[in-house]
């Protein structure tokens, strides 16, 4: 289906002509940053965001390829190095310390310089890197952690922690010999290493005694609290502060955020990771643009601005299952919330940023006609007269053998949420990939993210834009509508 | 997760109408494009028409100007309008929901359990 009028020249050249005059108007914002906005969408390498820009397009029943994303409007564009200190190919503890911490770190380390060794207890005192949240909160700004993971889970815990293995959730997850060595549970951290405004994601479970059950899922026990020491850590954190607020359904939140004697909130949906934005209950659960709206109410009220941290968890997901649905109706979603984001926002005063931490081995192409589903089948058929996907994973459980050969697939079943994409190498969980991300930046000192640059790049833009240390010398004029 | 339920299949005579109704369970509903399939005896599963959220149609050749599809997004109900009823519309009929109209006429992501239409002459 070729637009007519795409088949004309003129199109083209008075599209580029339009573009060529909106570049030529560009002007960098010179002054500080009041707020920052990091928005991290995991496992969203370009190719991602190329298939969710066709999906989005076409979820407003367009052809795709040419509906801009809200973070196709973003001014600046820089690529991203993702590769950890000990690894080509990067997990999301690693990268967390490099984009919000501004140092690069070990693979599933988080909040530590690569001097730390993974799940050794007794490397992580005196090798905490300090997270760019952490350095707002203490120049007076409100922070906030939104996800639709865990709030304990790699990515947000960059923020905030400071561990040798990710997967120390709560006391639980850890080995006698480490808490005995002092270590500290990420859930534990969550409380106590900073004073965080507002958090929202999942992960209840961490945070309860070990059977406590679920306000939700009161007779599944596999949902109940996991905590060994006993603690109800959102009881502490409640007692810390007089206008502190916890939720856990979406109702809930919605009256919270506009609660004005609320000033810290805290709302945990999930015992887990959130569901899947296909799979979410809309009266139970918000979703990652309510949430990201409900904090950045919170947030606002505070004169000296914000840092806010969202995360957009599920992407990586979807693609480690090889379901390219899944990622895809995630990353919809994502950008949905950088949209809303953008609305309540001013990018005068307002540094936002968009990128991923790592890409995934998820590739798009056979030369799908244009206007054809995303989740539709290449043209031709394969070598072995069967039928394929423009969407295809290098390696990951997609890859099945039928009578000792690939199978054929059909349209209906590609189109399923639960399809399985094909695979070139089998493996219980598709893999991150290795190449560079992209940064989309909008707002003051925007024009900072240019060219190629190491991850940990992207908290020095953030730290020098909001005048934080190290750069509390930044020489930069006070954000626009400020005074002082 | 979307289930659908399909309604209004019979026996009809050629030159004869039927309507179709699709209920959906989903509160979002309205985000999802809505589309009609069938299969005849015999044959693979076809495309008949789709509805996207913002109200683009689009029929297969064999059906256009007999059949027509529409929603009622306060019911969460799509419909399908079926005139001048023809032997070789004989099949069963699914409906079908997806991410706008390009998905759902050629990828869909959910299915209705479907309702015989049989057409004598």
């Known amino acids: 289906i070729i637009p007519v009028e795409e088949e004309n020249p003129d199109f083209w050249n008075r599209q580029a002509a339009e573009a060529l005059g909106a570049a030529k108007k560009l002007q960098p914002i010179q002054t500080a940053a009041k707020n920052l906005i990091i928005f991290l969408g995991d496992g969203m390498g370009v190719s991602t965001v190329t298939a969710a820009r066709i999906l989005k397009g076409q979820k407003e029943d367009k052809l795709g390829p040419e509906t801009p994303l809200a973070m196709d409007h973003f001014p600046y564009v820089a690529l991203s190095k993702t590769y950890s200190v000990d690894k080509h190919v990067p997990d999301s503890a690693a990268t967390a310390t490099a984009y919000l911490c501004g140092v690069k770190g070990n693979f599933q380390t988080i909040g530590l310089s690569a001097a730390a060794r993974y799940n050794q207890c007794n490397t992580t005192r005196g090798n905490e890197v300090v997270s760019v949240m952490n350095r707002a909160k203490k120049a007076g700004k409100s922070v906030g952690v939104v996800t639709t993971t865990r709030v304990q889970h790699a990515s947000p815990a960059g923020a905030y922690a400071h561990t040798v293995n990710r997967n120390w959730y709560s006391d639980a997850n850890m080995p006698g010999s480490a808490r005995r060595e002092g270590c500290k549970d990420i859930a534990t951290q969550l409380i106590s290493n900073m004073d965080i405004d507002v958090i929202l994601g999942g992960g209840r479970k961490y945070m309860f005694r070990m059977g406590a059950p679920d306000p939700e899922y009161p007779h599944d026990y596999s949902q109940d609290g996991t905590r060994m020491d006993g603690k109800n850590l959102v009881q502490e954190w409640l007692a810390k502060q007089q206008g502190a607020r916890y939720v856990w359904n979406r109702t809930e939140l919605m009256q919270a955020s506009l609660d004005p004697s609320v000033t810290h909130l805290m709302g945990l949906f999930e015992p887990g990771d959130m569901k899947y934005e296909i799979h979410r209950d809309p009266t139970l659960d918000p979703s990652l643009m309510e949430m990201t709206e409900a904090a950045l109410r919170l947030l606002s009220r505070n004169p000296r601005g914000f840092f806010l941290f969202v995360e957009g968890g599920r992407i990586d997901h979807g693609h480690h299952e090889s379901r390219a649905y899944r990622a895809l109706t995630e990353a919809v979603m994502f950008d949905d919330a950088i949209e809303r984001a953008g609305q309540l926002t001013s990018e005068e005063d307002t540094l936002t940023l968009v990128t991923a931490d790592h890409s995934h081995v998820f590739s798009f192409g056979a030369y799908p006609l244009r206007g054809s589903s995303i989740f539709g089948l290449a043209p031709g058929k394969a070598q072995d007269r069967k039928a394929y996907t423009a969407l295809l994973y290098g390696n990951g459980p997609g890859y099945v053998l039928k009578d000792g050969a690939r199978p054929d697939v059909t349209e209906s079943e590609s189109g399923s949420p639960e399809y399985r994409q094909q695979a070139a190498v089998p493996l219980d969980e598709e893999t991150h990939a290795g190449e560079d991300v992209a940064v989309f930046a909008r707002g003051p000192q925007a024009h900072l993210v240019h060219g190629v640059q190491e991850q940990s790049f992207i908290a020095h833009v953030m730290a020098f834009a909001a005048c934080l240390e190290p750069y509390t010398a930044c020489d930069l004029a006070p954000p626009a509508g400020t005074t002082d | 997760q979307v289930h659908l339920v399909e309604s209004g299949g019979g026996l009809v005579q050629a030159g004869g109408s039927l309507r179709l109704s699709c209920a959906a369970s989903?509160?979002?509903?309205?985000?999802?494009?809505m589309g009609w399939f069938r299969q005849a005896p015999g044959k693979e599963r076809e495309f008949v028409a789709a509805?996207?959220?913002?109200?683009?149609?689009e029929y297969a050749d064999s059906v256009k100007g007999r059949f027509t599809i529409s929603r009622d997004n306060a019911k969460d109900t799509v419909y399908l309008q079926m005139n001048s009823l023809k032997p070789e519309d004989t099949a069963v009929y699914y409906c079908?929901?997806?991410?706008?109209?390009?998905?759902?006429?050629?990828?869909?992501?959910?299915w209705g359990q479907g309702t015989q239409v049989t057409v004598s002459s």
């Open positions: 509805i996207g959220w913002s109200g683009v149609i």
């Open positions: 989903r509160r979002s509903f309205s985000e999802y494009a």
């Open positions: 079908a929901a997806g991410l706008g109209i390009r998905v759902v006429s050629q990828t869909p992501a959910y």
